[in-house]
Amino acid sequence: CDLPQTHSLGSRRTLMLLAQMRRISLFSCLKDRHDFGFPQEEFGNQFQKAETIPVLHEMIQQIFNLFSTKDSSAAWDETLLDKFYTELYQQLNDLEACVIQGVGVTETPLMKEDSILAVRKYFQRITLYLKEKKYSPCAWEVVRAEIMRSFSLSTNLQESLRSKE
């Protein structure tokens, strides 16, 4: 399955929207930095496309879930958030279309299941951090910066998969 060129454009737009969502000076948030333990190894180049697409799908689904909460709506600009949802939704559709076309339809490798679980646990740590920080503006900025970094890393994987073909 070939992800459309619009998919990588959508990824760039997503990052741009995340950058625009910033609401306060980040310099006041330095002490709120946190190690969320992004499972970078789950996005390594050792994966075949069939194994990668469900992991990328999980990543984007979890980002969607994180920013769809009531607390998120209170933290960010509504117009930007709506555009952000639209971009994520389109990317989920692109990835789902690939799965339907037969990529990953065969018996799910255990490695892929472990990767999906690692991504879920990563987002659980992010959710717990926000809860512990009482969804403060700085906590949300730290999370936004983290999502920009992890989304960028996973997007780079998509690009490397495309270039290897």
């Epitope: 330095l30 930095r33 910066a145």
Partner: antibody, heavy 121, light 107 residues
């Protein structure tokens, strides 16, 4: 390969203005902050200030606030440090270094080679 | 501002020695402490970040420990290329601040 390349050494007279530069390459320039550090001859490191090139937000050390201006041009991946009126006490080596911002990653992991500024009448 | 105090300010040691440098913060900085090495005429080089994480490419003889206000940089077996000045720096809050430096000289 990540690189921060600084402009060359400068010799200036007291009262003159100066703008030195730090060009980033090999990484996404707007994803990291750029900090400036001063080292006077035979002395230690002093943090001057920092800029977020994505929107040019800045923070300064109280010791340097109002004495220097930090700016950036993200279109050419370059950060700047400038003086409107140099003093002899500004004679020092000036370094730029990248900072991961709010991400949990190494601070000041890459440094420029330094720009020596000499102010003498 | 958070003050960073290093000790000793200088020390003499021999190749193979175990060297320990300490850094104390004027208030708790959790684990937000970095260690740098600087050689004459060169830019500083990051050795340790977040108190104990070894920067990529740095030899394993360098290690860092501590949290709160008291931190330590240890060189388990000093090598000829380790003779330099070492700085700690807090990255907990602005303004960022450095220690005054510890010069490691040949005995």
């Amino acid at each position: 390969e990540v690189q921060l390349v600084q402009s060359g050494a400068e010799v200036k007279k007291p009262g003159e203005s100066l703008k030195i530069s730090c060009k980033g390459s090999g990484y996404s320039f707007t994803s990291y902050w750029i900090g400036w550090v001063r080292q006077m001859p035979g002395k230690g490191l002093e943090w001057m200030g920092i800029i977020d090139p994505s929107d040019s937000d800045t923070a300064y050390s109280p010791s340097f606030q109002g004495q220097v201006t930090i700016s950036a041009d993200k279109s050419i991946s370059t950060a700047y440090l400038q003086w409107s009126s140099l003093k002899a006490s500004d004679t020092a080596m000036y370094y730029c270094a990248r900072h991961p911002g709010l991400n949990w990653a190494p601070d000041f992991d890459y440094w420029g080679q330094g720009t020596l500024v000499t102010v003498s009448s | 501002d958070i003050q960073m105090t290093q000790s000793p300010s200088s020390l003499s040691a021999s190749v193979g020695d175990r060297v320990t440098i300490t850094c104390r913060a004027s208030q708790s900085i959790d684990g937000s402490l970095n260690w740098y090495q600087q050689k004459p005429g060169k830019a500083p080089k990051l050795l340790i970040y977040f108190a104990s994480s070894l920067q990529s490419g740095v030899p394993s003889r360098f290690s860092g420990s501590g949290s709160g206000t008291d931190f330590t940089l240890t060189i388990s077996s000093l090598q000829p290329e380790d003779f330099a000045t070492y700085y700690c720096q807090q990255s907990y809050d602005f303004p960022l601040t450095f220690g005054q430096g510890t010069k490691v000289e040949i005995k």
